[in-house]
């Protein structure tokens, strides 16, 4: 497919990028998926000003952002390099905490009802955002 | 565990339509998170995707831009099954044809194959 | 559209061998890349997604590795049973393959 100009029905354009928001919450491995469906990738925050545009959109809703660490090392799902990239934690976070009584720690990032991120168990039903960048995204309806 | 069967005739003559049809157990072709797949393999296109279709509230349809004015893939719920159709077939058609699952980040379970070849 | 290069069409090599194969994309494609193992008369089958995670059932001598456009695919100690053509992939594209043959 070829590139396109503009974003896919539904979709907000910002700065290049073509965002979705979910309105209904998945598991992060889901959500993930539900993106990579529709050609794109969990939102991956490289900067306050996308930061503040996302939280602009979500509200005071836990929402899954495209950043985990559950094969050792905090990643973003894009391959945005996590050690020198934004962040914007929450005080005391990420913690890992095993006290939920879940199974396991906290793996998945996501955004806090103030916007700042917390860690979280993987399989909790939060909303999460789709991105995908403008100049990659096909003529066609989601692709793989 | 998902498991793949395809069938449909090996042999079709130019200027015919193609029809294979990709017969799944294991999961239903109603899933709101896989996504059902044609490819095909030759020696002088290597591994190419040819088209998908996915249900999410309605179903979606996706085509490889060299095949996109004669490629029709159509899910069937009754059967549970999906299948390939391309139409006027050329010998450049001749391949080996697969389905496959499509779940987070690979094509995870393909058919057998079929060999099809375009002669007269 | 993204091309994925893989070179050397062909590589040679022993049983209990450690084989390094490559895909080179032709732009960014994150950690977005799966590996596929194809034997003569099959249909391929996954062994690694997302770059670096192993498809179930693949053995522990399989291993990929990379991020952004150069990618690598591992076999640790060559089995008999891997010399095989591999491809990678990413979303509908896939590279052209590189052959593992008995030295």
């Known amino acids: 497919g070829s590139e396109r100009t503009c974003c896919p029905v539904n979709w907000v354009e910002h700065e290049r990028s073509c965002y979705w928001f979910s309105r209904s919450g998945k598991a992060w491995a889901d959500a993930d998926n539900y993106c990579r469906l529709e050609d794109a990738h969990l939102v991956v925050v490289t900067s306050w000003e996308e930061q503040k545009f996302v939280q602009h959109h979500i509200g005071p809703v836990n929402t899954w952002m495209g950043l985990h660490d559950q094969n050792g090392p905090w990643k973003w799902v894009d391959g945005t390099d996590y050690e020198t990239g934004f962040k914007n934690w929450r005080p005391e976070q990420p913690d890992d905490w095993y006290g939920h009584g879940l199974g396991g720690g906290e793996d998945c990032a996501h955004f806090t009802d103030d916007g700042r991120w917390n860690d979280d168990v993987c399989q909790r039903p939060y909303r999460w955002v789709c991105e995908t960048e403008l100049d990659k995204a096909s003529q066609e309806p989601p692709l793989l | 565990q998902v498991q793949l069967q395809q069938s449909g005739p090996g042999l079709v003559k130019p200027s015919q339509t193609l029809s294979l049809t990709c017969a799944i157990s294991?999961?239903?072709?109603?899933?709101?998170?896989?996504?059902w797949n044609w490819m095909r393999q030759s020696p002088s296109r290597g591994l190419e995707w040819l088209g998908r279709?996915?249900?999410?509230?309605?179903?979606?349809?996706d085509y490889a831009v060299s095949v996109k004015s004669r490629i029709t893939i159509n899910p069937d719920t009754s059967k549970n099954q999906f299948s390939l159709q391309l139409n006027s077939v050329t010998p450049e058609d001749t391949a080996v044809y697969y389905c496959?699952?499509?779940?987070?980040?690979?094509?995870?379970?393909w058919g057998q194959g079929t060999m099809v070849t375009v002669s007269s | 559209d993204i091309q994925l290069t893989q070179s050397p069409a062909t590589l040679s090599f022993s049983p209990g061998e450690r084989a390094t194969l490559s895909c080179r994309a032709s732009?960014?494609?994150?950690?977005?890349l799966a590996w596929y193992q194809q034997r003569p008369g099959q249909a391929p089958r996954p062994l690694i997604y997302?770059?670096?995670n192993r498809a179930t059932g693949i053995p522990t001598r399989f291993s990929g590795s990379g991020s952004g456009t150069d990618f690598t695919l591992t076999i640790s100690s060559l089995e008999p049973e891997d010399f095989a053509t591999y491809y990678c992939?990413?979303?509908?594209?896939f590279g052209r393959g590189t052959k593992l043959e008995i030295k």
């Open positions: 496959a699952s499509w779940t987070r980040g690979a094509f995870d379970i």
């Open positions: 279709t996915y249900y999410r509230s309605k179903w979606y349809y």
């Open positions: 997302d770059a670096t």
């Open positions: 294991g999961d239903s072709v109603s899933s709101n998170s896989v996504a």
């Open positions: 732009q960014s494609v994150g950690s977005y």
């Open positions: 992939q990413h979303r509908r594209t």
